[in-house]
């Protein structure tokens, strides 16, 4: 069976029907490049005006304008708000009332696209394997990133969160139109990784999505992650404005000027430092979501009532922090280089500035407890990775899981740890699952490109697709079309249950209280330490405009120094832990 032309609110669209075997039978309808909104530079997205005739939806559209990896050029385009749909079809009748899974990509709110990285037309976020194996509809889409998606003056002149609003427009479009593709508009699951996972979290917290989202999956990221909310948008807006020659004293004039500046210039005016800086690299993630008093009306910690009826899976990779550790402490990955106590202390103090010397010392002490007994470089390097993993991913995720569970009415809560080791041959032998290592398995790459993978990789992929799509179907990862290797029990506040995802998943894979000692440290010991005021002088950005990264400001609830008074945003980070 195949859909043919589908009528949407914008007009007719026609995709392609791809047979899954030479013998006919099952197939998948694929639609690429359906417009879901339009947007002017640094403005909220608007409904797409639509078209007459039948739109040929057969090619991915360009990604939203962003810097290249080298950060010296741009690619993509401003006209980028398009989505892609995969609809599995059986032999006879077209699919009807299928669960819908909407993917939000990661990339530090700075890069990425709905189709993902591409090698020889093999796109990372190709929805075919999830759709056909799980019998669900998969939707991916583009949203604005970098300055164009998240630049904000911290007031009404440039409220920011444009990229989040793009995401919302895509979700709302799916709600209004997916029935015509055979989807169930009342069963939408949003899922994402890294910045996409934090976006998923933020979308569930935003009042704008009331009634749109049934379930959510966050893979390595949360609204509570220290890198997910910018507390000093004005500082970074001024930095960009100076570079492109816009006034900085009056936010109204600055906004007006930025809106008419070449978008490519805006994009290139910001560079993320990839070489070691004074502070951990995440503090230089300038253009990220803000508490705007509207789309994100309050501190995320105060918005969990909005998730009371949204089923949630959240988890991390067991060495999510590795990617960041290699930038902050480059020796971590280098066999011939050593990590010193000073290196680690500097890293720790960069993540605990809000609590001053006492915070840094207490954190350093607990994380280095094992060093007396095992002072090996391997142990020290693993400690660096564990620390970054905890601060950036584990602790925020654990707090979010607890918040979700505590506020749940009908909602169910599940937790996982992805531990299938990285396949990167250049990594150390002790390496676990790095940040983003889970993506290939969720998107079924071991099946799509079997020559590049081992049977154990296919086992991991099969299990993840089964759990993820069952959850999308029923709200329970164990119940649905796909058999699973073991029962995944819901998260409870008492036991902190989580599923450890490895190549062999058995009943022993259900575990409890992940890194409980460290969770208690951050939530209790560290939390009660007095907050200190940072040295105002450290905040002066360099005069030299060519400087890649000015020292990031922050308010004193964050982990970097106190901002200039006029730069602070009213809403404070929660006092849950001192990020």
């Amino acid at each position: 069976a195949k859909l043919g032309a589908v009528y949407t609110e914008g007009g007719f669209v026609e995709g392609v029907n791809k047979k899954l075997s030479l013998l006919g039978g099952d197939s998948v309808d694929i639609f690429k490049g359906i417009p879901f909104a339009t947007a002017k530079t640094l403005e909220n997205p608007q409904r797409h005006p639509g078209w007459q005739g039948t739109l040929k939806a057969t090619n991915f559209k360009k990604r939203c304008l962003q810097a290249t990896i080298t950060q010296d050029n741009t690619y993509g385009q401003e006209d980028c708000l398009y989505l892609n749909i995969w609809v599995p079809q059986g032999r006879k009748q077209v699919s009807h009332n299928l669960p819908v899974m909407v993917w939000i990509y990661g990339g530090a709110f700075l890069m990425g696209s709905g189709q993902g990285a591409n090698f020889l037309k093999n796109y990372l976020y190709d929805g075919e394997e999830i759709a056909t194996r799980g019998n669900v509809i998969v939707v991916t889409f583009n949203y604005r990133v970098g300055p164009l998606g998240f630049l904000s003056t911290g007031d009404a002149n440039l409220p920011g969160n444009f990229g989040l609003r793009d995401q919302h427009m895509a979700i709302a479009w799916v709600k209004r139109n997916i029935a015509a593709f055979g989807g169930d508009p009342d069963n939408i699951t949003i899922f994402g990784e890294s910045a996409g996972a934090a976006s998923v979290s933020l979308q569930t917290l935003s009042p704008y999505n009331k009634g749109l989202i049934r379930r959510a999956i966050s893979q390595s990221g949360m609204a509570l992650s220290p890198w997910a909310i910018q507390k000093n948008p004005l500082f970074w807006a001024k930095t960009i404005a100076k570079k492109v020659g816009c006034p900085t004293e009056d936010t109204g004039k600055m906004a007006a000027c930025l809106k008419i500046t070449d978008p490519r210039a805006l994009t290139l005016a910001y560079k993320l430092p990839v070489k070691k800086q004074e502070y951990p690299v995440v503090h230089y993630l300038a253009f990220i979501p803000v508490i705007d008093g509207d789309f994100i009306p309050d501190d995320p910690i105060n918005l969990y009532n909005n998730t009371a009826d949204i089923d949630y899976i959240a988890g991390i990779n067991n060495m999510d922090g590795h990617l960041f550790a290699t930038i902050d402490v480059p020796a971590v990955d280098k066999t011939k280089q050593t990590v010193t106590e000073e290196d680690f202390y500097r890293l720790v103090s960069g993540h605990t500035v809000a609590k001053g010397l006492k915070g840094a010392q207490a954190t350093f002490d607990i994380y280095t407890e094992s060093w007396a007994q095992d002072p090996s470089q391997e142990n020290m390097k693993k400690t660096v990775v564990a620390f970054e993993t905890d601060v950036l991913f584990l602790i925020p995720t654990e707090i979010a899981l607890a918040q979700h569970k505590a506020h749940a009415k009908s909602a169910k809560t599940y937790s996982y740890l992805f531990s299938h080791p990285s396949r990167m041959p250049i990594y150390p032998k002790w390496m676990g699952a790095d940040h983003a290592d889970d993506l290939q398995y969720v998107f079924g790459k071991p099946f799509a490109t079997p020559l590049g993978y081992r049977p154990q990789d296919r086992a991991v992929s099969k299990a993840m697709i089964a759990y993820w799509t069952n959850f999308a179907r029923s709200g329970d990862p164990n119940m649905g079309n796909s058999p699973v290797p073991t029962h995944w029990y819901p998260y409870t506040l008492e036991n902190g249950n989580y599923l450890d995802i490895t190549k062999t998943i058995t009943s022993a894979s259900m575990k409890e209280h992940l890194r409980e000692k460290f969770l208690k440290f951050w939530a209790v010991t560290f939390e009660v330490l007095p907050t200190v005021t940072g040295d105002q002088d450290t905040l002066t950005p360099p005069e030299d405009d060519s400087e890649v990264a000015p020292d990031p400001p922050s308010d004193d609830s964050q982990v970097v120094p106190v901002p200039p008074t006029d730069d602070s945003v009213e809403a404070q980070m929660p006092a849950t832990i001192g990020f």
């Epitope: 043919g4 032309a5 589908v6 009528y7 949407t8 609110e9 914008g10 007009g11 007719f12 026609e14 409904r47 797409h48 005006p49 639509g50 078209w51 007459q52 005739g53 039948t54 427009m169 709302a172 709600k175 209004r176 139109n177 997916i178 029935a179 015509a180 508009p185 009331k210 009634g211 749109l212």
Partner: antibody
Framework: QVQLQQPGAELVKPGASVKMSCKAS????????MHWVKQTPGQGLEWIGV????????SYNQKFKGKATLTADKSSSTAYMQLSSLTSEDSAVYYC????????????WGQGTTLTVSS | QIVLTQSPAVMSASPGEKVTMTCSAS?????MHWYQQKPGTSPKRWIY???KLASGVPARFSGSGSGTSYSLTISSMEAEDAATYYC????????FGGGTKLEIK
């Protein structure tokens, strides 16, 4: 200017079929979607379906699948709706209406055809 | 499909009076459109994209709303405004409200 001409009335027997016409003028017929809408005193306005005359693509309200068939004749710039297996429930005023543009409201309406199903 | 519920079903207003009618959607939509229909005639596009007036529509009419709640307002009722007003949403399955019949007192 844009005009959509529909016959004023049709009287048919239960069980029979009827093919209503909607002749378009004042614009390029093959460039705009044509919708059909049913109006009854009890049910108000109901969207039946849409056709793109340029290539014949159609979409129907689930409720009218199997009941209504939309076609278009490019040479005469006329859209048609055939209703089959008629019952008294099908008695209503039927309008053809052209998109104003993409996802805007229906901008141009015919005068409507009153269908009476009676033996 | 999205269900639109209009209220009230029937209302009457004196000349010069302010009139407000509402349209509630069963789930969030991006824009609402409104039609005016008088007996024996076809519906006319009246307000589109929630708040924009179609050409020829008097300035006393206005539309507003977002999400699931929308309204049409007449700042000062006139005799020629007596008609039935339908709200309308364009998703993949367009739907109409049941109509509000506005009578002159």
């Amino acid at each position: 200017q844009v005009q959509l001409q529909q016959p004023g009335a049709e009287l048919v027997k239960p069980g029979a079929s009827v093919k209503m016409s909607c002749k378009a003028s004042g614009y390029t017929f093959t460039s705009y979607n044509m919708h059909w809408v049913k109006q009854t005193p009890g049910q108000g306005l109901e969207w039946i379906g849409v056709i793109y005359p340029g290539n014949g693509d159609t979409s129907y309200n689930q409720k009218f699948k199997g009941k209504a068939t939309l076609t278009a004749d490019k040479s005469s710039s006329t859209a048609y709706m055939q209703l089959s297996s008629l019952t008294s429930e099908d008695s209503a005023v039927y309008y053809c209406a052209r998109d104003y543009y993409g996802s805007s409201p229906l901008g141009y309406w015919g005068q409507g055809t009153t269908l009476t199903v009676s033996s | 499909q999205i269900v639109l519920t209009q209220s009230p079903a029937v209302m009457s207003a004196s000349p010069g009076e302010k009139v407000t009618m509402t349209c509630s959607a069963s789930s969030s939509i991006s824009y609402m459109h409104w039609y005016q229909q008088k007996p024996g005639t076809s519906p006319k596009r009246w307000i589109y994209d929630t708040s924009k007036l179609a050409s020829g529509v008097p300035a006393r009419f206005s539309g507003s709303g977002s999400g699931t709640s929308y309204s049409l307002t007449i700042s000062s009722m006139e005799a020629e405004d007596a008609a039935t007003y339908y709200c309308h949403q364009r998703s993949s399955y367009p739907t109409f409200g049941g109509g509000t019949k506005l009578e002159i007192k």
